[in-house]
Interface confidence: low
C-alpha cells in the first residue's frame, strides 16, 4: 500500500506565547526520504522544519526522528505569536539525486492563534469643548485574534451608543484591530466625568480591558463674572469685589482697570474648588474716595484658559456728585462694557 501522510487535526487553536503541537504520521517507511514542514502551499510556501538539514530553534520533534522505524513526524513550535497563524503541511520527500523529490503532502493543519487585544486607548479632541458642545472620542485596540470582539462605551456608568465601530482587516488575517467612535454632549457638570471604552474578548476570560478618558482633559467651563460693592469700611473707602465662579480648568488671569488703565494684575493663587470639580476665585479691590473727585469706571477683566476676556464694569461717582462729602455712590454694570455716568 502506498505511503499516506496523515495530519489528523484539521485545525489547532493555541494561545499566544504557548507551544503548538502539529501532528503528522506516515503509514509506511517506504520510500526512504526526509519529512519537511511548510507553512502555506505552492511556490511561496515557507519552510518551518527540515528533517535533513538546518536548525530550527523554535521547533522540536515529538518523537526521535533518527530512529529507523519512526513514522511519527509531529512537531512542536514554541512561543507562538499571531504571526505564526496559517496552514501547516507535513510533506514527505523521496530520496533523489541531486535533490530529494516531493512525494506526498498531508492535508494540512490550520493553526489559529488566540492573542489578547492591547489595552484600549481612548483619544479625544485636540481642543477643549464647552458645555452643550458635541465631541467625539475614539477607542483603539489591536493585535487580537480571533476576530470576534465586543466593544462598549460608558459615561459615568451609563452605556453610550457608538457612531461607528470597525474591525480590520475585514478578511482573514493573523491578528485584528478595532476602532470605535462615540459622540458625547458635554455639560458643565462633566469636569469629574469619565468616558470608558470596554473591550471583551475570548482571551480575556471575564475581565474586560478598559480605556479611560477623563473629561476634565477635554472640557472648558467659562466663569460667570460679577462685580459687587461691599459696605464701606470707612468714610473714604469703597470695597469692590470681582468674583469668577464655576470655571475649569484653573488657568485664570484677572486684571483691574481704572478708566481703562491697568491698575492691578492678579494671578490667582488660592482658588476654591467646588464639588463638581470647577473653581471659584474672588478678588478684592479697595477704592480710596479721597483720590477721586470725578466719576471712575472700574473694570474687572477676566481671561480664562487663553479665551477672549470677559469684562464687567462698575462706576463709582466722584465727590462732585455727592451732597454728603463723606460718601460715594456706585453704579454696577455687570452685563455690559459701556460706562454708566
Amino acid at each position: 500500500e502506498e505511503l499516506q501522510v496523515i495530519q489528523p487535526d484539521k485545525s489547532v487553536l493555541v494561545a499566544a506565547g504557548e507551544t503548538a503541537t502539529l501532528r503528522c504520521t506516515a503509514t509506511s517507511l517506504i520510500p526512504v526520504g526526509p519529512i519537511q514542514w511548510f507553512r502555506g502551499a505552492g511556490p511561496g510556501r515557507e519552510l518551518i522544519y527540515n528533517q535533513k538539514e538546518g536548525h530550527f530553534p523554535r521547533v522540536t520533534t515529538v518523537s526521535d526522528l533518527t530512529k529507523r522505524n519512526n513514522m511519527d513526524f509531529s512537531i512542536r513550535i514554541g512561543n507562538i505569536t499571531p504571526a505564526d497563524a496559517g496552514t501547516y503541511y507535513c510533506v514527505k520527500f523521496r530520496k533523489g539525486s541531486p535533490d530529494d523529490v516531493e512525494f506526498k503532502s498531508g492535508a494540512g493543519t490550520e493553526l489559529s492563534v488566540r492573542a489578547k487585544p492591547s489595552p484600549p486607548e481612548v483619544s479625544g479632541p485636540a481642543d477643549r469643548g464647552i458645555p452643550d458642545q458635541k465631541v467625539n472620542f475614539t477607542c483603539k485596540s489591536h493585535g487580537f485574534s480571533p476576530r470576534n470582539i465586543t466593544l462598549k462605551w460608558f459615561k459615568d456608568g451609563q452605556e453610550l451608543h457608538p457612531l461607528e465601530t470597525t474591525v480590520n482587516p475585514s478578511g482573514k488575517n493573523v491578528s485584528y484591530n478595532i476602532s470605535s467612535t462615540v459622540r458625547v454632549v458635554l455639560n458643565s457638570m462633566d469636569v469629574n466625568s469619565k468616558v470608558i471604552c470596554e473591550v471583551a474578548h475570548i482571551t480575556l476570560d471575564r475581565s474586560p480591558l478598559r480605556g479611560i478618558a477623563n473629561l476634565s482633559n477635554f472640557i472648558r467651563v467659562s466663569p460667570t463674572v460679577k462685580v459687587t460693592q461691599q459696605s464701606p469700611t470707612s468714610m473714604n473707602q469703597v470695597n469692590l469685589t470681582c468674583r469668577a465662579e464655576r470655571f475649569y480648568p484653573e488657568d485664570l488671569q484677572l486684571i483691574w482697570l481704572e478708566n481703562g488703565n491697568v491698575s492691578r494684575n492678579d494671578t490667582p493663587k488660592n482658588l476654591t474648588k467646588n464639588t463638581d470639580g470647577t473653581y471659584n476665585y474672588t478678588s478684592l479691590f479697595l477704592v480710596n474716595s479721597s483720590a477721586h473727585r470725578e466719576d471712575v469706571v472700574f473694570t474687572c477683566q477676566v481671561k480664562h484658559d487663553q479665551q477672549p476676556a470677559i469684562t464687567r464694569n462698575h462706576t463709582v461717582l466722584g465727590f462732585a456728585h455727592s451732597s454728603d462729602q463723606g460718601s460715594m455712590q456706585t453704579f454696577p454694570d455687570n452685563n455690559a462694557t459701556h460706562n454708566w455716568n
Epitope: R39, G44, E46, L47, E53, H55, F56, P57, R58, A83
Partner: antibody, heavy 123, light 107 residues
C-alpha cells in the same frame, strides 16, 4: 557541504561605494534568510539586518538604514551588501551568515558564516 | 535594544580544566540565545542555539544552560583548540544583539 564564500578584501576612499558578495552553496538558497554582521576592530559584533531570500525584501537594523543596501542574485545563490558614501567608521570585517526560515524573526541563530570581507576606508 | 553583557573580557584556564563563560541579557529573552566561538582571523563558528542545544559536530564538552536573563557556556576538559573568543547572541527581539566576548587564554 554548506558554504558561504565572500568576495575579497576592499580598500576604498571616503565617499566611494563598495559592494560585497556572498555566494551560498550546499543548500536551498531561498529556504534561509541571509544576514549581515559587522565586526569593527575592538568593537562588539553588530547585526546589520537580513534579506528574505525568497521575496528579496530587506530588513535593516536602525544603525544601518540609509547608506546600506542588501540585494540578491537568486539564480546565482548570491547575496550582496552595498555601502554607499563610505566613511572611515565603515572600516571593519563584514560577514554574511544564514538563519533558518524567516516566517518569524525568532529564527535568528546563525548556523553558517562566510569567511568575512575586510573593508578599509582611508583617504 | 537588548544589551548582552559578558562581564569577563578574559578568562585564564589550563588544559583539562572546566571553565564557565557567563552572559547576562538586559531583559528576558527566554531561551532565544546562541553561543559562538571565534579564533583570530576567522569567522565565528556556531556552537549552541536555543540556549542549550549543540549544533551537529560540536564536541559534547561544550554545554549551554540558562533561560530568561542569565546564561552560561561551560567547557569541560578544555583543549588547546578551545582557546578562542566566545560570544553570546540573543535572537528574541530585533535588533539581534551580541555580547562583547570573553577571551579564553592559557594561565
Amino acid at each position: 557541504q554548506i558554504q558561504l564564500v565572500q568576495s575579497g578584501p576592499e580598500l576604498r576612499k571616503p565617499g566611494e561605494t563598495v559592494k560585497i558578495s556572498c555566494k551560498a552553496s550546499g543548500y536551498s538558497f531561498t529556504n534561509y534568510a541571509m544576514n549581515w554582521v559587522k565586526q569593527a576592530p575592538g568593537k562588539v559584533l553588530k547585526w546589520m539586518g537580513f534579506i528574505n531570500t525568497y521575496t528579496g525584501e530587506p530588513t535593516y537594523a536602525d544603525d544601518f538604514k540609509g547608506r546600506f543596501a542588501f540585494s540578491l542574485e537568486t539564480s546565482a545563490s548570491t547575496a550582496y551588501l552595498q555601502i554607499n558614501n563610505l566613511k572611515n567608521e565603515d572600516t571593519a570585517t563584514y560577514f554574511c551568515t544564514r538563519t533558518r526560515g524567516y516566517y518569524d524573526f525568532d529564527g535568528g541563530a546563525f548556523d553558517y558564516w562566510g569567511q568575512g570581507t575586510s573593508l578599509t576606508v582611508s583617504s | 535594544d537588548i544589551v548582552m553583557t559578558q562581564s569577563q573580557k578574559f578568562m585564564s584556564t589550563s588544559i583539562g580544566d572546566r571553565v564557565s563563560v557567563t552572559c547576562k541579557a538586559s531583559q528576558n529573552v527566554g531561551t532565544h540565545l546562541a553561543w559562538y566561538q571565534q579564533k583570530p582571523g576567522q569567522s565565528p563558528k556556531a556552537l549552541i542555539f536555543s540556549a542549550s542545544y549543540r549544533y551537529i559536530g560540536v564536541p559534547d564538552r561544550f554545554t549551554g544552560s540558562g533561560s530568561g536573563t542569565d546564561f552560561t557556556l561551560t567547557i569541560t576538559n578544555v583543549q588547546s583548540e578551545d582557546l578562542a573568543e566566545y560570544f553570546c547572541q540573543q535572537y528574541n527581539t530585533y535588533p539581534l544583539t551580541f555580547g562583547a566576548g570573553t577571551k579564553l587564554e592559557l594561565k
